[in-house]
Interface confidence: low
C-alpha cells in the first residue's frame, strides 16, 4: 500500500525547491525498479516529484490566501513491466499560513452622528476589520483594536472595535472629531500586522443654548401716520444652536401704553416690532418698551439651560408730521 | 462655499416662453429667500423676483407680473424663473441672488445667464 | 416705490485718490435698509455694504458706508485699480430697487 505523511508546505517560501515530503508504496524495496508519477493541478508546475524515491517538492512560491490546498494524485509503475504497483491515489497538499497579511477595514469611510453633550459609555460605532490569514492559525488573524487619536473624548473596546464617548463634548466649541483606529493582529505579539481606519465623528445639536439679544438697547423710530400693523424696526438675538434649536419666538414682556407688538419672523429669526394702536407726536414724543426672546422648541430635560430668558429695551422715537 | 450657477438662458421670439434655472451649492438652500434679477445690456440692475425659503411666498415686480413666475425645488436645491410671454424689453442677463440671513440685502450672487428676445 | 437717484453719474479719479458716491432715496428708508453693490465688467454685482454702514465678509476698510433717512454716500478712502467699476445702492425698506448707478473710471 502507499505510505505517506501528511503534506504540509508552508506559503511564500523563497527557495526554487522546497522538500516537501515522500511519497511511496511499501512494496519499494528501494533498487529503483519503481517509477513514481504526479497527476493533477499544479503536478509539474507547482510541485515536482523524484520519480526514483518519490520525494515531493514545491517549486514555486505559494500564497495561502489565493489557494489553501492542491488535490493531487499519485501513481507508481513498475519499470520493468509497465503496470501499476499500487491504484492511483488522491492526496492532500495543504499550504500552511503565515502571517502576511495586515487588517483591513472594508466598510470604509466611517462616519456616524451623535448628539453633544451625550454621557460617557454612548455607543458611537462599531469599526470591524478582516484578515485574509488563517483565523485557525494561531493569532495571525486574531485583532485587537486601538485608538491613535482621538483621546480624551472617544475609547475603543480592544476585541470589539466600539467606538464609545469618553468624555463629553460641546457642539458649539467643536462640531466634528476624526478618531483613527487601529487593528493589530498576532494579538499585538511581535510580528504583528497593522492597518488604520479614520472615522468621522459628527456631533448633533441639542438645545443647549438659549438665544441671547445682540444688543442691550435698540433704537427704532415711528412715524406719527404710520397706520397700525406697520412694521416699524426689527430686534435680533443669536443663538449658538442650529436649526429647530435655534428657532426663536419673541414677545413683549413690558408695554405699559399697550401700543406695541412684537411678531417672529420664523424665516430670518428676527422680532419685527408692530404698531398696534396709532402715535401722536403731540400726545407722547417717546415709548419704551422690553421685549424677550425665547426658544421655540425646548425637551423638558433641557429646561436647565433656559432659566431667564434674554431681555432688551427698546426706545421708539415718534416723528413728527406736519399737519395741515 | 456658497455657489449660484443660471442656466437656461438664450435666444427666443416675442411672446414665447422660457425657463431659468439657478443651481445653488454650499449651504442651507431651504435657509434662505431667493430673488431674480436682471440687467439690461449697457443699463442697470433691475429687481425681479423674490421667493421665501420655504416657497409659501411670491413677490414680482410690476413689470413682470403675471407673465413670469418664480419657484424652488429643495430637494434639487434648485431655483427656477418660468418667463411666459415674453417682450424685447425683458432681454438681459439675468441673475439669481442669495438674500442675506438677517437682512434683505444679496450676499451671493450668481454669473448670469443671458436672455435675448428678437424676432 | 422708492426711487434712488445716484450722483455723479462717472466719477474720474486716479489711483490714490478719494471717492465720494451719493445715493438720494425718494421718500426715507427705514432703518437704515440700504446696501451699495461694486459691479465690474462682465462679472455679477457683489455686495459691499448692508445697513448703509456694515461691511460685508471680506471688503477692505477703505469701502466705507455712511448716511440714514434719504441721504446716504459710499466712500473708497483711496482707490486702488481693482476699484474701478460701476457702484449700485440699493434699498430693501420697501420691496427692493437699485440706483441707476455710478461709474468710477481712470482719469
Known amino acids: 500500500g502507499w505510505v505517506w505523511n501528511q503534506f504540509f508546505v508552508p506559503e511564500e517560501m523563497n527557495t526554487t525547491s522546497h522538500h516537501i515530503g515522500q511519497l511511496r508504496s511499501d512494496l519499494d524495496n528501494g533498487n529503483n525498479s519503481f517509477q513514481y508519477k504526479l497527476l493533477g493541478a499544479g503536478a509539474g508546475s507547482t510541485f515536482i516529484i523524484d520519480e526514483r524515491t518519490g520525494d515531493i517538492y514545491a517549486i514555486q512560491k505559494l500564497d495561502r490566501e489565493e489557494r489553501s490546498l492542491y488535490i493531487l494524485r499519485a501513481q507508481v509503475i513498475d519499470i520493468a513491466t509497465g503496470r501499476a504497483v499500487e491504484p492511483e491515489s488522491e492526496f492532500v497538499i495543504k499550504v500552511s499560513d503565515i502571517n502576511d497579511n495586515e487588517p483591513k477595514f472594508l466598510d470604509e469611510p466611517y462616519e456616524a452622528i451623535v448628539p453633544e453633550m451625550s454621557p460617557e459609555g454612548t455607543l458611537v460605532i462599531q469599526v470591524t476589520a478582516s484578515d485574509a490569514d488563517d483565523p485557525s492559525s494561531g493569532n495571525n488573524a486574531r485583532l485587537l483594536y486601538s485608538l491613535l487619536q482621538g483621546q480624551p473624548y472617544f475609547s475603543v473596546e480592544p476585541t470589539t472595535g466600539v467606538i464609545r464617548i469618553s468624555s463629553k463634548m460641546d457642539r458649539e466649541l467643536q462640531d466634528e472629531y476624526w478618531v483613527i483606529i487601529q487593528a493589530k493582529d498576532m494579538i499585538g505579539q511581535p510580528g504583528a500586522l497593522s492597518g488604520t481606519t479614520s472615522v468621522l465623528i459628527k456631533l448633533s445639536d441639542v438645545n443647549d443654548n438659549k438665544p441671547i439679544f445682540k444688543e442691550s438697547l435698540y433704537r427704532l423710530t415711528v412715524s406719527e401716520s404710520a397706520p397700525t400693523g406697520t412694521s416699524i424696526g426689527t430686534i435680533m438675538a443669536y443663538d449658538n444652536d442650529i436649526g429647530e434649536n435655534a428657532e426663536m419666538d419673541y414677545s413683549i414682556e413690558e408695554d405699559d401704553s399697550q401700543t406695541f407688538d412684537i411678531i417672529t419672523n420664523h424665516e430670518t429669526q428676527e422680532g419685527i416690532v408692530i404698531l398696534k394702536k396709532k402715535v401722536d407726536f403731540e400726545h407722547q414724543n417717546h415709548y419704551g418698551i422690553r421685549a424677550k426672546v425665547k426658544n421655540h422648541h425646548v425637551p423638558e430635560q433641557l429646561m436647565k439651560y433656559h432659566t431667564e430668558a434674554s431681555t432688551t429695551f427698546i426706545k421708539i422715537q415718534v416723528e413728527d408730521v406736519d399737519e395741515p | 462655499q456658497v455657489q449660484l450657477v443660471e442656466s437656461g438662458g438664450g435666444v427666443v421670439q416675442p411672446g414665447r416662453s422660457l425657463r431659468l434655472s439657478c443651481a445653488a451649492s454650499?449651504?442651507?438652500?431651504?435657509?434662505?429667500?431667493m430673488h431674480w434679477v436682471r440687467q439690461a445690456p449697457g443699463k442697470g440692475l433691475e429687481w425681479v423676483a423674490v421667493?421665501?425659503?420655504?416657497?409659501?411666498?411670491?413677490y414680482y415686480a410690476d413689470s413682470v407680473k403675471g407673465r413670469f413666475t418664480i419657484s424652488r425645488d429643495t430637494s434639487k436645491n434648485t431655483l427656477y424663473l418660468q418667463m411666459n410671454s415674453l417682450r424685447a424689453e425683458d432681454t438681459a442677463v439675468y441673475y439669481c441672488a442669495r438674500e442675506r440671513y438677517f437682512d434683505w440685502s444679496f450676499d451671493y450672487w450668481g454669473q448670469g445667464t443671458l436672455v435675448s428676445v428678437s424676432s | 416705490e422708492i426711487v434712488l437717484t445716484q450722483s455723479p453719474g462717472t466719477l474720474s479719479l486716479s489711483p490714490g485718490e478719494r471717492a465720494t458716491l451719493s445715493c438720494r432715496a425718494s421718500q426715507s428708508v427705514s432703518n437704515t435698509y440700504l446696501a451699495w453693490y461694486q459691479q465690474r465688467p462682465g462679472q455679477a454685482p457683489r455686495l459691499l455694504i448692508y445697513?448703509?454702514?456694515s461691511r460685508a465678509t471680506g471688503i477692505p476698510d477703505r469701502f466705507s458706508g455712511s448716511g440714514s433717512g434719504t441721504d446716504f454716500t459710499l466712500t473708497i478712502s483711496s482707490l486702488e485699480p481693482e476699484d474701478f467699476a460701476v457702484y449700485y445702492c440699493q434699498q430693501y425698506s420697501n420691496s427692493w430697487t437699485f440706483g441707476q448707478g455710478t461709474k468710477v473710471e481712470i482719469k
Open positions: 421667493i421665501s425659503y420655504d416657497g409659501t411666498n411670491e
Open positions: 445697513g448703509a454702514s
Open positions: 454650499g449651504f442651507t438652500f431651504s435657509s434662505y429667500d
